[in-house]
């Protein structure tokens, strides 16, 4: 299975925020050395509020030189956090968000963790391990998701208006049954969309219309009678 | 948390006329659709129609078109369905029901014999 | 009218064992339904909203999926109480329709 489209593994810490982690136990480094160096990028949803943490190539920390960590970040300077094994000290270039930290000391762990990940940790995470036998490379593509708020609502007779507000990427709306829809999406500054659908349904036998909206965090449907036309007062069926 | 308090049983002779009653509390009466639904003994259920309190417009299933009439009164949140011209086949249990089909009364039952 | 066909129409099942039963619509036209379960004597308690959505206070062994024209109820690990009928409802279109029906008794 290729890198970009592992599930995320999902668990719950002490403070009941879900962890995410691409991290290999050793079991599977042994049997996925060659695969995981060659494939050196991967891209990584993860959901906002959560906890991330990024690994470093399964190398034997007693081989290792130095581990570097390279973090590009939209509108921001690249950011390094280095470990020289053999002087045991780390170092810091233009690294000012807290929550990017190493796991526990880099002499015992290589891996990164960002503590409740937001909209803000966008970006390009690389671990660069040197050892002897030479540098190897794992990249982030860290792609944080931004569950939308889903809102249904009736605004005139038979009309019906579905919006997904500030969700990342943008959501996608449907409904049931298909009506004269007109979606429009709206993008924030913080790289957030809101996706609005207004739909309206001729059909007098439509009863009961159902937005569902899609989205890379999961899948919500809400429905909603609707009302009747204006002075129409009685119908068979 | 929405109630609806449907009135109490009826015995009724075939040709008759009998008026079930749903008062309704706990949501906004005039904003939601009323439906009505039959289950005859041992059956399953049937959807009679349904009316909007906000302006009175009403669907009837055709097989009740003509002898179901479903009226309300916004003042007391109550609606009403009447059956008329009563027959051995309409003894059933009726409920009404509002919320899009997720709030029931507890039903009435008509019983027609002669 | 949209016809609501469901299946089994009875089934006989040991506590502890898995239930699935399935609500079909007709003309292929996609709907959105509500999954009942009624004891004798009882109104129908809704127990799924909305083809998937576990009602509050209803256990978590019942479950509802599906979409567009083919949905499914199912229980997960049947217990002694959850003998009695089981109804879906479509309620998208007008006249609304309900399936016939499936009875579940325990072995």
């Known amino acids: 299975q290729p890198n970009n489209s592992l599930m995320l593994q999902t668990s719950k810490e002490n403070h009941a925020l879900a962890s995410s982690s691409l991290c290999m136990d050793e079991k599977q480094i042994t049997q996925n050395y060659s695969k995981v160096l060659a494939e050196v990028n991967t891209s990584w949803p993860v959901k906002m509020a959560t906890n991330a943490v990024l690994c470093c190539p399964p190398i034997a920390l007693r081989n290792l030189i130095i581990i570097t960590w390279e973090i590009i970040l939209r509108g921001q300077p690249s950011c390094t956090k280095a470990y020289k094994k053999e002087t045991n000290e780390t170092k810091e270039t233009n690294c000012t968000d807290e929550r990017i930290t190493w796991v526990s000391r880099p002499d015992q762990n290589s891996d990164l963790q960002i503590r409740t990940v937001a909209i803000t940790h966008d970006g390009y995470y690389r671990c660069i391990m040197v050892t002897p036998d030479g540098n190897f490379h794992r990249g982030y593509h860290l792609q944080v998701l931004v569950t939308p708020e889903v809102t249904l609502f009736q605004n005139r007779n038979r009309t019906a208006v579905c919006k997904a507000v500030a969700g990342k990427p943008a959501a996608h709306i449907s409904w049931i049954p298909e009506g004269d829809c007109a979606t429009k999406q709206e993008y924030w500054s913080n790289g957030t969309v809101t996706v609005k659908s207004t739909c309206h349904w001729e059909v007098h036998n439509v009863s009961t219309v159902t937005c569902h909206v899609s989205h890379l965090t999961g899948n919500k449907s809400l429905y909603i009678e609707l009302l009747p036309v204006p002075g129409a007062k009685k119908s068979a069926k | 948390q929405v109630q609806l308090v449907q009135s109490g049983a009826e015995v009724k002779k075939p040709g008759a006329s009998v008026k079930l009653s749903c008062k309704a509390s706990?949501?906004?009466?005039?904003?939601?659709?009323m439906h009505w639904v039959k289950q005859a003994p041992g059956q399953g259920l049937e959807w009679i129609g349904n009316?909007?309190?906000?302006?009175?417009?009403?669907n009837y299933d055709e097989k009740f078109q003509g002898r179901a009439t479903l009226t309300v009164d916004t003042s007391t949140r109550t609606a009403y369905m009447e059956l008329s011209s009563l027959r051995s086949e309409d003894t059933a249990v009726y409920y009404c029901?509002?919320?899009?089909?997720?709030?029931w009364g507890r039903g009435t039952l008509v019983t027609v014999s002669s | 009218d949209i016809q609501m066909t469901q299946s089994p129409s009875s089934l006989s099942v040991s506590v502890g064992d898995r239930v699935t039963i399935t609500c079909q619509a007709s003309?292929?036209?996609?709907?959105?339904l509500h999954w009942f379960q009624q004891k004798p004597g009882k109104a129908p308690k809704l127990l799924i909203s909305?083809?998937?959505n576990l009602e509050d206070g209803v256990p978590s062994r019942f479950s509802g999926s599906g979409s567009g024209t083919e949905f499914t109820f199912t229980i997960s690990s049947l217990q002694p109480e959850d003998a009695a009928t089981y109804y879906c409802?479509?309620?998208?279109?007008?006249?609304?329709?309900f399936g016939q029906g499936t009875k579940l008794e325990i072995k």
């Open positions: 409802l479509q309620f998208t279109y007008i006249p609304w329709t």
């Open positions: 909305g083809a998937s």
């Open positions: 003309q292929g036209t996609p709907i959105n």
């Open positions: 009316i909007y309190p906000g302006s009175g417009s009403i």
């Open positions: 029901l509002t919320m899009t089909g997720t709030s």
């Open positions: 706990g949501h906004t009466f005039t904003s939601y659709w």
